[in-house]
Every structure is written in structure tokens, then in C-alpha cells.
């Protein structure tokens, strides 16, 4: 084993190229200079190294940068990123959105790994807040990203970033998350006209208080049942039959199909039977 630590004559790597795929692991260790590897990281992805060979290359970078890789190297890691542990990534200082995109691209199509979660956390903390461009990027790769954040983390999202949010990005958000996001959405969209405003705010209404639902009921919005079913129960309960009828418009007929589910069930139980009868849906309080 001892003699294998020296690089065989004529095998010293002058550049990172395809010839290295024929090197044994110990030859890569002995014959590839770490500084050369760092300056030519962009070439590594074009070369079909085995996982074992990539382990050696990572080891060389770890030795060269024990405090964490510089961003110039991180941006070109490519598939070597998949070899990184969350502990490795916590040492990084990633500030460029291009670097983030490059690494997310490597993991594209897969579930969010602990490595990616750590990378995103480092990036967002470095920026100080979840700005619009970052949110755009993250939700493009992971539509459920926003709903993976705690209400506390969402508190740092500036209202301007809300423009980047698509309805599907909120599909898995719970009421506590919408609690925080809804006021931001109200600030972001308030200068839009009535119908456009409703289209934008609709996905966030799971965080709306009763008073806002009452206000919406006066605006002929025709809320669909799917949206109504996601409203906070405590916000729906004080609404009158007339207000719910105005809020839902032609969709009010859908209440019958949902009469056993919250918040419709609880709302029905709060209404006078005479009022429910005015809907003509056979709802029983």
C-alpha cells in the first residue's frame, strides 16, 4: 500500500479531463492536485466519474478547504453536490442565486433532500429574508416549499415576494401558515381592482378573518366551494346565511354536498333553520 501513495511516473494530471476516468482511486488521490481540481471544477460534470472516484475528488476538496468551499467551487460542484453532507453545507456561504439554481438543478425531480434543505436554509439566512427572486426560484423547483416553512420562518417573507406565489404553492399550507401569509398578500394585492384582486387573494383566504369574508360577500366574488372549505372555521361561523349566499353566489348549491364536513357542518349548526330554508337546499341545522 505504501508505494501506491506516490504518483506513478507520467501520470500527474495536468488538467481535469476524460483520461482521469481510467485512474484508480489511489491514483486520483496521488496524481490530481487539489488546487487544479478547484480551478477546473466546471469540467468534472462532463466526465463520467464513478461514485467512488467522486468520493476521492470530494476528499481532495475537503482537505484544501477545511473551513468550507468558496462559492467559486460550490457553483460548479454539479453532481459532486450529491456527495455533500448537511454538515459540509453548513460551512458554506452561498450568496449568489445562480449558485443556488445550479445546485437545485442537480437535485431536480427528486424530493427535497436534507442537503438541499440545508443549502436553502444557508442561502435564505445569508440574504436575511426570502426575497421575490429567491422565492420564485425555490417554488419553481419545489412547489411545496413555502408550506414547508414554519409560521416563524414565513414571518420574514416580505409582502413584495408574495407576487411570486402561485395557487399550487399553497396547496399544503395549514391555517397557521396562512395566518401569516394572508396579511402579506393583502398588502401586496390591495391596489388591484375587485375581480383581479379576488383571483390573487383567493389562495390565501384560509388566513382571512370574519370581517374580511363579510367584506368580500359584498363584492359579488362567487367563491368556489374548494376555497370555502379551506376557510378558518372560526372565521366562517359568524357569517349569516345571507352573507354566505352572497359570498358563494351560484356555488351556494355546493353546500349540500359538504354539509357533513367542516367548516360547513359547524356553520350550519349555528344558523336558524328558517334562515337555512331560504337557500332551498334542504340543509338541516
Amino acid at each position: 500500500e505504501v508505494e501506491k501513495t506516490a504518483c506513478p511516473s507520467g501520470k500527474k494530471a495536468r488538467e481535469i479531463d476524460e483520461s482521469l476516468i481510467f485512474y484508480k482511486k489511489w491514483e486520483l488521490e496521488a496524481c490530481v492536485d487539489a488546487a487544479l481540481l478547484a480551478t477546473q471544477m466546471d469540467r468534472v460534470n462532463a466526465i463520467p466519474f464513478t461514485y467512488e472516484q467522486l468520493d476521492v475528488l470530494k476528499h481532495k476538496l475537503d482537505e484544501l478547504y477545511p473551513q468550507g468551499y468558496p462559492e467559486s467551487v460550490i457553483q460548479h460542484l454539479g453532481y459532486l453536490f450529491l456527495k455533500m453532507s448537511p454538515e459540509d453545507i453548513r460551512k458554506w456561504n452561498v450568496t449568489s442565486l445562480e449558485t443556488l439554481k445550479a445546485l437545485l438543478e442537480v437535485n431536480k425531480g427528486h424530493e427535497m433532500s436534507p442537503q438541499v434543505a440545508t443549502l436553502i436554509d444557508r442561502f435564505v439566512k445569508g440574504r436575511g429574508q426570502l426575497d421575490k427572486d429567491t422565492l420564485d426560484t425555490l417554488t419553481a423547483f419545489y412547489p411545496g416549499y413555502l408550506c414547508s416553512l414554519s409560521p416563524e420562518e414565513l414571518s420574514s417573507v416580505p409582502p413584495s415576494s408574495i407576487w411570486a406565489v402561485r395557487p399550487q404553492d399553497l396547496d399544503t399550507c395549514d391555517p397557521r401558515q396562512l395566518d401569516v401569509l394572508y396579511p402579506k398578500a393583502r398588502l401586496a394585492f390591495q391596489n388591484m381592482n375587485g375581480s383581479e384582486y379576488f383571483v390573487k387573494i383567493q389562495s390565501f383566504l384560509g388566513g382571512a378573518p370574519t370581517e374580511d369574508l363579510k367584506a368580500l360577500s359584498q363584492q359579488n366574488v362567487s367563491m368556489d366551494l374548494a376555497t370555502f372549505m379551506k376557510l378558518r372555521t372560526d372565521a366562517v361561523l359568524p357569517l349569516t346565511v345571507a352573507e354566505v349566499q352572497k359570498l358563494l353566489g351560484p356555488h351556494v348549491e355546493g353546500l349540500k354536498a359538504e354539509e357533513r364536513h367542516r367548516p360547513v357542518r359547524d356553520w350550519i349548526l349555528r344558523q336558524r333553520q328558517d334562515d337555512l330554508d331560504t337557500l332551498g337546499l334542504g340543509l338541516q341545522g
Partner: nanobody
Framework: QLQLQESGPGLVKPSETLSLTCTVS?????????WGWIRQPPGKGLEWIGS???????YYNPSLKSRVTMSVDTSKNQFSLKLSSVTAADTAVYYC??????????????WGQGTLVTVSS
């Protein structure tokens, strides 16, 4: 148009509890989506401390959670912050903040002018 005004002692001893009150004028505190506190240590960026939402849910910065208590008194149009076991690292300008407009067509986020709290013996 809401006006927010922070009040409380400007000097607190280490290990004691910092208590601040935010008095709201120009409108009812009940029409707010949330009531919150933010601070800015000297030479550093803003740090969110916590918020109480209209729904009744309260959220605190995880790094401060064990030491923070926030409450709202709608009858006095005030909300308050208590931060226990303070150290010199808690020296900062403290701002109260609120977003009104519940049930209205427009909404606005308001901040107090800030109050400097120094932790020193």
C-alpha cells in the same frame, strides 16, 4: 391612520425582565391583522421578535422563544412585550408594528418610532 408609540424603561439590568408597551392611537387595535415587535441592535440588522395574530395565534422568533411573552389588551388599545433574563446582547432599538385594515378595502403596516433599551448594570 394608526400611530404606534413604544414606552418602557430605557435601561434594564442584566438578568432582569425587559417590559415594553405599545400604545395605538388613531384607530382600534381590534382592526389589526397582527401586533408585533422587531428590534435592531446597534450596528446590526432588524431582528423579528414575535407577532400575535388576529386569529389569536402567537409566533415567536425560535432563538428568543423561551424568554419572550407578548400580550394584547384591546380595551386599552395596547400590546406589550416582556423579555426575561436579558443580557447586553439584548441592547437594541425596539419597534412595535401592526397591520390594520381588517374588514376594510385597504390595509397598511405601521411602525412605532422605536425606543432604545440598554442592558447594563
Amino acid at each position: 391612520q394608526l400611530q404606534l408609540q413604544e414606552s418602557g424603561p430605557g435601561l434594564v439590568k442584566p438578568s432582569e425582565t425587559l417590559s415594553l408597551t405599545c400604545t395605538v392611537s388613531g384607530g382600534s387595535i381590534s382592526n389589526s391583522y397582527y401586533w408585533g415587535w422587531i428590534r435592531q441592535p446597534p450596528g446590526k440588522g432588524l431582528e423579528w421578535i414575535g407577532s400575535i395574530y388576529h386569529s389569536g395565534n402567537t409566533y415567536y422568533n425560535p432563538s428568543l422563544k423561551s424568554r419572550v411573552t407578548m400580550s394584547v389588551d384591546t380595551s386599552k388599545n395596547q400590546f406589550s412585550l416582556k423579555l426575561s433574563s436579558v443580557t447586553a446582547a439584548d441592547t437594541a432599538v425596539y419597534y412595535c408594528t401592526s397591520q390594520d385594515g381588517v374588514g376594510a378595502t385597504t390595509t397598511e403596516e405601521y411602525w412605532g418610532q422605536g425606543t432604545l433599551v440598554t442592558v447594563s448594570s
